[in-house]
Structure formats: structure tokens, C-alpha cells
């Protein structure tokens, strides 16, 4: 029998400086574009190579962005969230939620949700 797959959720404040080509990531989500079932939150879907986020190194694909410069991202339309990032200024503070997969159960068995198997 496979072990249970659990998740360790942590939050982090990430301060990015907008680079020549911007912040350097893509997002999905919003009230009109639910990426995760029953969750209209905003998630990172791509980190652009050599962009500001990639060079900083802390933001990861799959992270949930909770706020931008202190402004909550709950209940936003997708395009409104995009516009909020684009208008966020030179120094951008992101409150993010990392979700790290943790394997519990018998050693040597992978859970169904483990992408490494």
C-alpha cells in the first residue's frame, strides 16, 4: 500500500526589485480562472529564466501569492491580478505560500501525487 502524501505549508515574504524585463514570472488563478478546485487564489505557473524572480531564487512554480505590497489577492478576477502586479512599482513585496510535498508511510513507496515516480 502506498504511504499518505501530506504537505508542509510555509509562508514567506519575498521582496523583488523589478528588472529590465519586469518581475519575471507568470500566474494562473482568479475568481474567473480557478486553477485549483475550490480555490480562486493566484498561483505562480512559470518562472522566467534570468528574470528578477529567478535571480532572487525564492519564488517557485506552484507557490500561492497571498498579497502584493500588502494588498490581498483574494477574490480578484484574473486580469485584475495581472494588472495589480504590472502596476506594483519598482520594489515589490510578495507574501507567498510554499507547499512542500512530504511523504509519509512505508519507505520505498511513493504516493500517487509524487511526480518523481
Amino acid at each position: 500500500m502506498n504511504g499518505r502524501v501530506d504537505y508542509l505549508v510555509t509562508e514567506e515574504e519575498i521582496n523583488l526589485t523589478r528588472g529590465p524585463s519586469g518581475l519575471g514570472f507568470n500566474i494562473v488563478g482568479g475568481t474567473d480562472q480557478q486553477y485549483v478546485s475550490n480555490d480562486s487564489g493566484i498561483y505562480v505557473s512559470r518562472i522566467k529564466e534570468n528574470g528578477a524572480a529567478a535571480l532572487d531564487g525564492r519564488l517557485q512554480e506552484g507557490d500561492k501569492i497571498l498579497s502584493v505590497n500588502g494588498q490581498d489577492l483574494k477574490n480578484l478576477l484574473h486580469q485584475d491580478a495581472v494588472d495589480l502586479f504590472r502596476n506594483a512599482g519598482y520594489a515589490v513585496s510578495l507574501r507567498v505560500q510554499h507547499r512542500l510535498q512530504v511523504q509519509n508511510g512505508p519507505i520505498g513507496h511513493r504516493g500517487e501525487g509524487d511526480p518523481s515516480g
Partner: nanobody, 125 residues
């Protein structure tokens, strides 16, 4: 990993029409930003059209003749090509990226996209 498969290419007389399709894998197709590029023999890859959450974008050379659209239920993007000209002859490629950039979107920049199809040949005589 997203996989893209183009279809619908072929040979047509000038003034005719074709509809290209690009079918994508993945359960979150509605979140993809997608585009069509083309490459004629001996020429650079050229932007044709793109469709994002916020709307459609076209190269000047195809505006008014080509229409990009998508059917999220079928995981498919389309390029309706009317009033075709010999200079539209090329291999047409579908491209995609998951989500919307938080930066200024440059639909014609190939670096905006992570995934590419194998292409479908369009010949206009």
C-alpha cells in the same frame, strides 16, 4: 509537460481558406496563453497571432484575414485563415505557456512560450 499537435495544413489556391487546429494536453488548458508562429524556407520564424486571457493579438500582415480562437472544452486553439496569399506559405507552429505574464506581454516574442508543436505545412499557390 504540455504537448501540442497541429493539424489542418495543406495546399490551397490563392484567395482560398484553411483552418489550422492545435490540440494541447493538460487539464488546465483554459489558463494557457497560446500563439501561432510561421516559418517560410530560408526566413526567420515570424509571429502570426496569439490569444491570452485578455484577448487576441495579430501581426499586421494577417490582420483582417486571419482569426485566432479557442475551444477550452476541446483543449484546442484554431487559426482561421482566409484570403490566403502565396506569401502565407510556411510551416505553421503552435506555441503555449501556462498562465499570464505579470510583465508586459510581448506576444511576438518566442521566449514568452515554453511549449512548441512540430508544425503543419501550408502551401498557397
Amino acid at each position: 509537460q504540455v504537448q501540442l499537435v497541429e493539424s489542418g495544413g495543406g495546399s490551397v489556391q490563392a484567395g482560398g481558406s484553411l483552418r489550422l487546429s492545435c490540440t494541447a494536453s493538460g487539464r488546465t488548458f483554459s489558463t494557457y496563453t497560446m500563439a501561432w508562429f510561421r516559418q517560410a524556407p530560408g526566413k526567420e520564424r515570424e509571429f502570426v497571432a496569439a490569444i491570452s486571457w485578455s484577448g487576441a493579438y495579430y501581426a499586421d500582415s494577417v490582420t483582417g484575414r486571419f482569426t485566432i480562437s479557442r475551444d477550452n472544452a476541446k483543449n484546442t486553439m484554431y487559426l482561421q485563415m482566409n484570403s490566403l496569399k502565396p506569401e502565407d506559405t510556411a510551416v505553421y507552429y503552435c506555441a503555449a505557456v501556462i498562465g499570464s505574464t505579470v510583465d508586459s506581454y510581448r506576444p511576438g516574442d518566442p521566449l514568452e512560450y515554453d511549449y512548441w508543436g512540430q508544425g503543419t505545412q501550408v502551401t498557397v499557390s
